[in-house]
């Protein structure tokens, strides 16, 4: 069971200080941007991260969402990264949801932080370069200190 | 680059088995699904079942469960698509196609150049 | 499972006109439709996503529309590299994907 606490206004980097948004065809991707290039292109670099306390404590249980015309809620269904139209709910009735993630920090290095699906245990969100595109997937953690499942989350409230 | 690369062209006898494979490269192989669709001579586009590299899980067509087995080898990157009696019913095309993940989202984004299958007596 | 008609069966226009393709869905599938244009020879290639948004380097002539059970791809003035078979895929129930039977666009 998972129940609806306050939300926070985000910005979310890789480790290589790319910035995480949302483009014109609802598709994530990190990209270099300056302060003033991340204001300008909220609110599509601005993800509201709602917080939910967790039945079974296993990590700060989150979901991450972005308002651009309308609320779209990250998913990793069928371990498949979107976007889905819909708000973050006030109260979810199950042990684990596609939508939401533990966000923890690196052991050892509080600022670091890992996104684990709470439906697929092992597989964290993480930054992949494709082509001349760094992309946000679902990975599963294959070797300790794996850089790609490491963001940095900077709040903007 | 990013890009499925397939085996080549079989023909084979009724009652011989096969096993097609699927490289993928320029990408994390292992966190994206892998799903095989059947082109048969003149006709339109058929999807068999998926494969997820990363753990093997496997999702099948109704109507091609029990007709062929798709399994993957994530060390080598590869998936495949395997049939233990051929029929001559199974002469197509058949295409890998990477489902997208994040960017085109459940869509087939990146496809393979297809393996023609040949079965004749 | 989900079943999607595609009109016409083959479509003869001449370049520089339009070209209007349709798609049906036998249930609603909201707009989780995407279109591939595949040429002989060739793998089909993903052309639209989530019914009207156009993958990377799709030429702006092609738009997509619709939602529900009723979709078009539309060509505004058709090049001849645009001559090929188009299908619609629906997604809504991955993954229990269904194509439709496809339409051929031919010069007139």
């Known amino acids: 069971y998972f129940g609806k606490l306050e939300s926070k206004l985000s910005v979310i980097r890789n480790l290589n200080d790319q910035v995480l948004f949302i483009d014109q065809g609802n598709r994530p991707l990190f990209e270099d941007m300056t302060d003033s290039d991340c204001r300008d292109n909220a609110p599509r670099t601005i993800f509201i991260i709602s917080m939910y306390k967790d039945s079974q404590p296993r990590g700060m249980a989150v979901t991450i969402s972005v308002k651009c015309e309308k609320i779209s809620t990250l998913s990793c269904e069928n371990k498949i990264i979107s976007f889905k139209e819909m708000n973050p709910p006030d109260n979810i009735k199950d042990t684990k949801s596609d939508i939401i993630f533990f966000q923890r920090s690196v052991p050892g290095h509080d600022n670091k932080m890992q996104f684990e699906s709470s439906s697929y245990e092992g597989y964290f969100l993480a930054c992949e370069k494709e082509r001349d595109l760094f992309k946000l997937i679902l990975k599963k953690e294959d070797e300790l200190g794996d850089r790609s499942i490491m963001f940095t989350v900077q709040n903007e409230d | 680059e990013v890009q499925l690369v397939q085996s080549g062209t079989e023909v084979k006898k009724p009652g011989e088995s096969l096993k097609i494979s699927c490289k993928g490269s320029?990408?994390?192989?292992?966190?994206?699904?892998i799903g095989w669709v059947r082109q048969m001579p003149g006709k339109g586009l058929e999807w068999m079942g998926f494969?997820?590299?990363?753990?093997?899980?496997?999702r099948y067509s109704p109507t091609f469960q029990g007709q062929v087995t798709i399994s993957a080898d994530k060390s080598f990157n590869t998936a495949f698509l395997q049939w233990s009696s051929l029929k001559a019913s199974d002469t197509a095309m058949y295409y890998c196609?990477?489902?997208?993940?994040?960017?085109?989202?459940?869509?087939?984004?990146?496809w393979g150049q297809g393996t023609m299958v040949t079965v004749s007596s | 499972e989900i079943v999607m008609t595609q009109s016409p069966a083959t479509l003869s226009v001449s370049p520089g006109e339009r070209a209007t393709l349709s798609c049906r869905a036998s249930e609603s599938i909201s707009s989780n439709l995407a279109w591939y244009q595949q040429k002989p020879g060739q793998a089909p290639r993903l052309f639209i996503y989530t019914a009207s948004t156009r993958a990377t380097d799709i030429p702006a002539r092609f738009s997509g529309s619709g939602s529900g059970t009723e979709f078009t791809l539309t060509i505004s003035s058709l090049q001849s590299e645009d001559f090929a078979v188009y299908y619609c895929q629906q997604y809504n129930n991955w993954p229990s994907i269904t194509f439709g039977q496809g339409t051929r666009l031919e010069i007139k």
């Open positions: 196609a990477r489902v997208g993940s994040g960017w085109y989202p459940y869509t087939f984004d990146i």
């Open positions: 320029g990408y994390t192989v292992t966190s994206y699904w």
């Open positions: 494969i997820y590299p990363g753990d093997s899980e496997t």
